[in-house]
């Protein structure tokens, strides 16, 4: 039975040219996290594997940095980075948990962080 929940940074916004940290946190389960995938639509950005370490997709290596923790830092943001991001937690024995973050990249300096929320 999957009892865990993923808490994410929710809906966030950031300035064009700036950077943003995407964070998810898995709680309420004793399952072992074996891997976390960070994906944008169908594109893989990065993987943090408990045994293999971090892998950043070649097409993102200049703009993506691992961490902090299991999170991901996006740098040199463009308006094309606006969209949904998913953290996919592979756990044992529970299975897979998925969290969603919506990032809006703004042209001006009106960017603010949205509220945190939970995805069961």
């Amino acid at each position: 039975m999957m009892t865990g929940t993923i808490e994410t940074t929710g809906n966030i916004s950031a300035e064009k040219g700036g950077s943003i940290i995407l964070q998810c946190h898995l709680s309420s389960t004793t399952a072992q996290v074996t891997q976390v995938n960070w994906e944008q639509q169908d594109q893989l950005l990065a993987i943090c594997n408990a045994d293999l370490g971090w892998h950043i997709s070649p097409s993102f290596k200049d703009r993506v940095a691992p961490g902090p923790g299991l999170g991901l830092t996006l740098q040199s943001l463009t308006v094309n980075d606006t969209g949904e991001y998913f953290c996919i937690y592979h756990t044992y024995p529970d299975g897979t948990y998925t969290g969603r973050i919506f990032l809006e990249v703004l042209e001006s300096s009106v960017a603010e962080h949205g509220a945190r929320f939970q995805i069961p």
Epitope: Q43, L44, I47, D51, L52
Partner: antibody, heavy 118, light 107 residues
Amino acid sequence: QVQLQESGPGLVKPSGTLSLTCAVSGVSIRQGHWWSWVRQPPGKGLEWIGEIYQTGRTNYNPSLKSRVTISVGKSRNHISLKLSSVTAADTAVYYCTTGSGWYPIDYWGQGTLVTVSS
Amino acid sequence: SYELTQDPAVSVASGQTVRITCQGDSLRSFYASWYQQKPGQAPILLTYGKDTRPSDIPDRFSASSSGDTSSLTITGAQAEDEADYYCSSRDRSANVVFGGGTKLTVL
């Protein structure tokens, strides 16, 4: 220099269990390193079977997962492979291999042919 | 079936340049590694990463990638390059996948 030496029965009966051992020398099982098994049926291509990490965690080819067990020997310089319920389709040269992190296989054993036949 | 697709056979005249390709969705997220295998021998690693060769691999072997395709180029193919060539990568579940192999004939 890393050396990998596979050993085990060259003939296994159908429905039986294939058991192979890989003797590892020149390197210790260390953080970030993994040990894997790859097979190659006669005249065909390479197929990854699975791997084991320093932590003891394993990762298996989904198509073989229900039949495969990879483990580290008590002496920690041997890796073992067990493949259950074998059929003639499991006849292959079995290679013990190693690598580190997300990098590819960088060392291979010389391989050992296992034939499944009654 | 293989998740990475290779042409089964390719031929090249001695001294000429040949390109062996590998296609698959995982190559959008992972660089391919390339292996050479001669009859009765274990494979050896030729290239990995963006285009890195182990120190004992001749520089006539090089790799490149674009989109979902990785290529191994042999510049000035020699008779001893006649072999089977396999591409490999991880997938997003951290599984290792291999291509079906390409048999290179040097004429």
